[in-house]
């Protein structure tokens, strides 16, 4: 069975084709080659001689036991080599020779027992080394690491490392890899020698499910003393063994580290006193809790110095009391419990993401809700009922506002967005909004993107509601049950580039409403019920138009519509996916491509 | 279509078939077997994925005695610092994991429950596997 040609001459997918040898019938120019799940078993020297341009090579699960000297010789452009799941028994010293551009090497689950004997010291361009899920017992980074000056990611997770000694990291003292991210999760650690990490700088250190008791965790974290880390991730996994006990003593050792950003990711334990628990983390710039349960929600009003707080997928008894002077960014998403939003006091806040919490807002939105006048980004999407009772007084700095898939109430009772003259992006898609007031978008003079799909309009008619939106470049009106539109609805939108009118209920097409759209490039009218044109003579769309989508409509392919069908043919160079433009009627022409119709009508009336 | 038996409990019998062309082998054990009246146990899965599990989610299509419930989407792996360790599993890497589960207080009516599980992962998204579970529920006297 031949390989699948994904991109001609470039990308070939040869997965699971029972190949015993490297195929020789693929073009020399191949850049991406997936040979995974083939029983190759043995790679001799110059195995890939036929593919000098290769950039990505996937050899996952190829039953490879032996890799000889120079197996990849000639692959001087290869940037990614994937060897996952091969039971390698013999790896020649020159196995990886010739890989002068290699940036990513994945040797996950390859029976690797030690980094010392892994022949990669010459791979100077290497940025990412993934040796997770192996049999490595020693964390000693061999001397050759001093050659790997570009290394940014080292994944040693799911190995057998139990202890870390001062000598293990000597090479990092000699040539500090300032940008190195190190993942040691799922190693059964019980000892980190104090001083092992002294004066070491890491970009990121991840330690999840490393400790089988609170005491071990405590002493190991104390062993990290002197480490300077940009981002520290601690925690567990839901499907691995979890700590039976967790208290404030666990993290006391963090006081001896310099940490910029901290994240606790999954803990099968109720956190009650977070002030004591995170006492050593009051001055990190970014603090993040993922998938934890928090009992006392008042603690977030303590004088933490965080600039970014992230609470994701957590459980709360009620919406937390948030009073944090220095906080600039708050991400509070996908949490459970506390369904009603309560006011927060965050005077420096500029970015607020409250999406996907099922929250309801009794009154939205003004400065008093968030305790700030600096807000630029507000995401309230995928929540419950949000009642609009104020038009963003004190929130005039907003540039990005997202309500999608929440249930907005009182949207047509006053000009909700009147204060938002700096707003650039607005998404009110699928918010149960029924537009019954022409002033709904008054005030939005800077708006560039408006998404309002999945709403409805009085009498299914689009009125002149966009008159002030002179900077609009993107407008989505799909799934709005629209049937008619004002001929002047779009007259002020001279900057509009993309207009999505798909999935509405138009029976006919009219070019007249678009005559002022001098910048329009994309017009999508797919999934309507267009049968013909509104007027006999259709004018041209704006000359800027590059893509016109009329697919999945109800074209009536009869002589009476000859001029419309001919007009469609004349637009051929604009039309996308023409094969999905089919006749719906009459029954003998149903399913025929509109563009293949021979429209020569004998008018036998 | 070959049917794979999972287990029997006092009130349920569970089996599955593949609903995709690939039919890549997957081993599923439940211990103890699920009782629909209330249950607590361990689900053990052994599987070698044909693509990375990053951003794994399930589409669930549940049928209760021929009545279709709305499609449910269950996100398992968000893409960074995920709850489950297998979320970091790569294409071709052995996934050998045990997941605890528990539920209680749901009353199910007697009959045939079908659940099509479409596993989608990766970027771009593609189907990882598709399994159709059949649960025959025979509530006992209490």
């Amino acid at each position: 069975e031949p390989c699948v040609e994904v991109v001609p001459n470039i990308t070939y997918q040869c997965m699971e084709l029972n190949f015993y040898k490297i195929p020789d019938n693929l073009p020399f120019s191949t850049k991406n080659l997936d040979l995974s799940f083939n029983p190759l078993r043995h790679l001799g020297s110059y195995s890939f001689f036929s593919f000098p341009e290769l950039q990505v090579l996937d050899l996952s699960r190829c039953e490879i036991q032996t890799i000889e000297d120079g197996a990849y010789q000639s692959l001087s452009h290869l940037s990614t080599l994937i060897l996952t799941g091969n039971p390698i028994q013999s790896l020649a010293l020159g196995a990886f020779s010739g890989l002068s551009s290699l940036q990513k090497l994945v040797a996950v689950e390859t029976n690797l027992a030690s980094l010392e004997n892994f022949p990669i010291g010459h791979l100077k361009t290497l940025k990412e080394l993934n040796v997770a899920h192996n049999l490595i017992q020693s964390f000693k980074l061999p001397e050759y690491f001093s050659n790997l000056t570009n290394l940014e990611h080292l994944d040693l997770s799911s190995n057998k490392i139990q202890s870390i000694y001062c000598t293990d990291l000597r090479v990092l003292h000699q040539m500090p890899l300032l940008n190195l991210s190190l993942d040691l999760s799922l190693n059964p650690m019980n000892f980190i020698q104090p001083g092992a990490f002294k004066e070491i700088r890491l970009h990121k250190l991840t330690l999840r499910n490393n400790f089988d008791s609170l005491n071990v965790m405590k002493t190991c974290i104390q062993g990290l003393a002197g480490l300077e880390v940009h981002r520290l991730v601690l925690g567990e996994f839901r499907n691995e063994g979890n700590l039976e006990k967790f208290d404030k003593s666990a993290l006391e050792g963090l006081c001896n580290l310099t940490i910029e950003e901290f994240r606790l990711a999954y803990l099968d334990y109720y956190l009650d006193d977070i002030i004591d628990l995170f006492n050593c983390l009051t001055n990190v710039s970014s603090f993040s809790l993922v998938s934890v349960t928090i009992e006392r929600v008042k603690d977030f009003s303590y004088n933490f110095g965080w600039q970014h707080l992230e609470l994701v997928n957590c459980k709360f008894g009620q919406f937390p009391t948030l009073k944090l002077k220095s906080l600039k960014r708050l991400t509070f998403t996908s949490n459970k419990g506390g369904n009603a939003f309560s006011e927060v006091d965050l005077p420096s806040l500029e970015f607020l993401d409250l999406s996907r919490n099922g929250l309801s807002f009794k009154g939205c939105c003004s400065q008093s809700d968030f305790g700030t006048t600096s807000l630029k980004y507000l995401d309230l999407s995928f929540n419950g009922v949000i009642t609009m009772s104020s038009n963003f007084l004190g929130l005039e700095q907003l540039e990005h506002l997202d309500f999608q898939h929440s249930n907005l109430k009182q949207m047509s009772e006053f000009s909700v967005f009147l204060s938002l003259r700096n707003l650039i992006y607005l998404d009110i898609s699928h918010t149960h909004t029924r537009v019954a007031f022409n002033g709904i978008f008054n005030g939005l003079s800077s708006l560039e993107v408006l998404k309002m799909a999945g709403n409805s309009f009085q009498e299914n008619f689009l009125p002149d509601i966009f008159t002030e939106l002179r900077n609009l470049t993107f407008l989505d009106l799909s799934q709005c049950q629209l049937e008619q539109l004002s001929p002047t609805a779009f007259n002020s939108l001279s900057s509009l580039q993309v207009l999505n009118m798909s999935h509405n209920n138009f029976f006919s097409l009219d070019t007249f409403p678009y005559k002022c759209l001098n910048s329009l490039q994309v017009l999508d009218y797919s999934l309507n019920h267009i049968m013909t044109s509104k007027k006999q003579e259709l004018q041209h769309f704006p000359s800027s138009l590059a893509f016109l989508n009329l697919t999945q409509n109800d074209f009536a392919c009869t002589c009476e519509h000859q001029s419309f069908l001919q007009w469609i043919k004349d637009q051929r160079q604009l039309l996308v996916e023409v094969e999905r433009m089919e006749c719906a009627t009459p029954s003998d022409k149903q399913g025929m491509p509109v563009l293949s119709l021979n429209i020569t009508c004998q008018m036998n009336k | 279509q070959k049917q794979y038996w999972v287990c029997n409990s006092s009130d349920a019998s569970i089996s599955y078939t593949y609903c995709d062309k690939m039919q890549y082998p997957i081993s599923i054990n439940v211990n103890p077997c699920i009782e629909l009246k209330r249950s607590k146990g361990l689900l053990h899965i052994f599987y070698i994925p044909r693509r990375d599990l990053k951003q794994l989610y399930f589409n669930l299509y549940i049928t209760v005695n021929t009545m279709n419930l709305p499609k449910r989407k269950e996100v398992i792996c968000r893409g960074s610092d995920d709850d489950y360790s297998f979320c970091r599993a790569l294409k071709g890497e052995t996934v050998n994991t045990t997941i605890s589960f528990s539920f209680k207080g749901i009353k199910f009516s007697k009959g045939k429950y079908k659940c099509v599980v479409e596993a989608i992962s990766g970027s771009p998204e593609e189907m990882l596997f598709c399994l159709e579970f059949v649960i025959l529920h025979q509530p006992n006297s209490n």
Partner: nanobody, 119 residues
Framework: EVQLVESGGGLVQAGGSLRLSCVAS????????MGWFRQAPGKERDIVAR????????YYAESVRGRFTISRDNAKNTVYLQMNSLRPEDTGVYYC????????????WGQGTQVTVSS
């Protein structure tokens, strides 16, 4: 399952009038487009008129424009076709059609009702 049942067909003289009715049962179709197709003897089935769920939009084939009127009563789940100034070429079987609530066009069909216009 949705069922469409037409009535009102029959024999009429040229210049006369008929009113066709179509009742939908099985589920409410108040939001979907409905319409009438005609199959004249020896010809293909083709659309005559169509109306949106809100009655805001209508479409008529050129041959019936000004003579036929499509309307609907959503409370009764019924769509009508008022046919005036009938001509012999209007003879045929008239079918009621409805889109699916998901938006698929011409998803449900009635069995048809015969209209014969004699000269």
């Amino acid at each position: 399952e949705v069922q469409l049942v037409e009535s009102g067909g029959g024999l009429v003289q040229a210049g006369g009038s008929l009113r066709l009715s179509c009742v939908a049962s099985g589920r409410t179709l108040s939001t979907v487009n409905m319409g009438w197709f005609r199959q004249a003897p020896g010809k293909e089935r083709d659309i005559v008129a169509r109306i949106s769920g809100s009655s805001v939009s209508t479409y008529y084939a050129e041959s019936v424009r000004g003579r036929f009127t499509i309307s609907r009563d959503n409370a009764k789940n019924t769509v009508y076709l008022q046919m005036n100034s009938l001509r012999p070429e209007d003879t045929g079987v008239y079918y009621c059609v409805a889109d699916s609530p998901g938006g698929r066009s011409y998803e449900y069909w009635g069995q048809g009702t015969q209209v014969t216009v004699s000269s």
